[in-house]
Amino acid sequence: MRTEAQVPALQPPEPGLEGAMGHRTLVLPWVLLTLCVTAGTPEVWVQVRMEATELSSFTIRCGFLGSGSISLVTVSWGGPNGAGGTTLAVLHPERGIRQWAPARQARWETQSSISLILEGSGASSPCANTTFCCKFASFPEGSWEACGSLPPSSDPGLSAPPTPAPILRADLAGILGVSGVLLFGCVYLLHLLRRHKHRPAPRLQPSRTSPQAPRARAWAPSQASQAALHVPYATINTSCRPATLDTAHPHGGPSWWASLPTHAAHRPQGPAAWASTPIPARGSFVSVENGLYAQAGERPPHTGPGLTLFPDPRGPRAMEGPLGVR
């Protein structure tokens, strides 16, 4: 079964939260600023799939949605490589590929995406550690990592493989439209900042919708502005979720897929960074590198081009997410 998150409709802020119209105008610059800052931020997606033909075989796909050139990809399980995770494969665009059991075949699918086939038989069965992480080292963005999980057991009765989502078609109008809005937004932001240059900034009220993250309050004062923020999200569509990625689903039910497009964690990343990163419940957006945790009800709209990554018609469900404007 597939779970879909709906694109949120932006609602006006609640009067109780924001008060007068004047306050609302002050929210806009922050939203626009965040959009301007995060528009070019790279993302990593991870997708885990059980092969219907071989129930003990799993395919992990990872991709990097950024403008930089990839210098190294590391796939690990049981957590990030530097935090107790075990490396399954390392791929270098020029120096080659190395993999470790139970990895069977690692390969580049495109210049910015890789796939790894795992053998599920034996003591080192994939479900012994269900979290898979992909780390992309790129220039100039640095190091970006995302994790996804896979189900603990398979039901042989489910013979039909899960249907992957269709590849998104980013038409030129959409790309130009988003770019135009962002450009206009940034110009408008500069105009607003210039206008309010000499006024003292009023204190924003804390958001009721983001109790988990006090740091987010200055940035995300309303439900509407949170939904508008282009920040990463986590969606794990599996019935086997490790403690670190315990994300709820709107529709429930088991799925053999796990897709996780996310900004994930920027270097430096060690055990502490991994352990202390809260993964909030359903449809939450998580951005570790800029210290922003803005929680909203559903996914942000699709915004990006970079959609030719998977010529394969079975392309990743991870492509469903917000890809940003490059």
Partner: antibody, heavy 114, light 106 residues
Framework: EVQLQQSGPELVKPGASVKISCKAS????????MNWVKQSHGKSLEWIGD????????NFNQKFKGKATLTIDKSSSTTYMELRSLTSEDSAVYYC???????WGQGTTLTVSS | DIVMTQSQKFMSTTVGDRVSITCKAS??????VAWYQQKPGQSPKLLIY???NRYTGVPDRFTGSGSGTDFTLTISNMQSEDLADYFC????????FGGGTKLEIK
């Protein structure tokens, strides 16, 4: 320029232990695993094992489990291989090699003789 | 353990020849195969990785092919400096090398 500089030749007695070093320069050691390979005189190459610089985790060829120990000193970008309970069968040239086996040390010749 | 077999221990060749060195894996290794060249008194050098990808700086007369269990390294226009030992290696499950093939002049 990437270089893997290994320690010099060793002549040891049977039953003893030896520790061979491999110092990496020109790239960040912590980015890559380090492999160790044995080449007996006039023979093929045998993979001994590798070490993950991030967490010190090791993988071994079953044949060398109990014979070789791999360690790493991140501060000096040096990996070490200790071979114990040496016999004449252990006489060989030992190479360290980068993760992708595209950079190799010059080799360390180990002679086990009484 | 996966065994890599290079059936030809020695191969006689002349300059300008087309030479094919073969390697067989005991089980399916996909394309997780590399080829190395080793000259006397030197460390091995990586030539080919992922069965068919030529490593940086390797002359284009060296090509690799194959997948699954059968792999071939071809030198299209043999040069005197290519006289060396050639080893295949699988890295699908840990790493194992073939026994090597020595190229000699006829």
């Amino acid at each position: 320029e990437v270089q893997l500089q290994q320690s010099g030749p060793e002549l040891v007695k049977p039953g003893a232990s030896v520790k061979i070093s491999c110092k990496a320069s020109g790239y960040t050691l912590t980015d890559y695993y380090m492999n160790w390979v044995k080449q007996s005189h006039g023979k093929s190459l045998e993979w001994i094992g590798d070490i993950n610089p991030n967490n010190g985790g090791t993988n071994f060829n079953q044949k060398f489990k109990g014979k070789a120990t791999l360690t790493i000193d991140k501060s000096s970008s040096t990996t070490y291989m200790e071979l114990r309970s040496l016999t004449s069968e252990d006489s060989a040239v030992y190479y360290c090699a980068s993760l992708f086996f595209d950079y190799w040390g010059q080799g360390t010749t180990l002679t086990v003789s009484s | 353990d996966i065994v890599m077999t290079q059936s030809q221990k020695f191969m006689s060749t002349t300059v300008g020849d087309r030479v094919s060195i073969t390697c067989k894996a005991s089980q399916n290794v996909g394309t997780a195969v590399a080829w190395y060249q080793q000259k006397p008194g030197q460390s091995p050098k990586l030539l080919i990785y992922s069965a068919s990808n030529r490593y940086t700086g390797v002359p284009d007369r060296f090509t690799g092919s194959g997948s699954g269990t059968d792999f071939t390294l071809t030198i299209s226009n043999m040069q005197s400096e290519d006289l060396a030992d050639y080893f295949c290696q699988q890295y699908s499950s840990y790493r194992t090398f073939g026994g090597g093939t020595k190229l000699e002049i006829k």
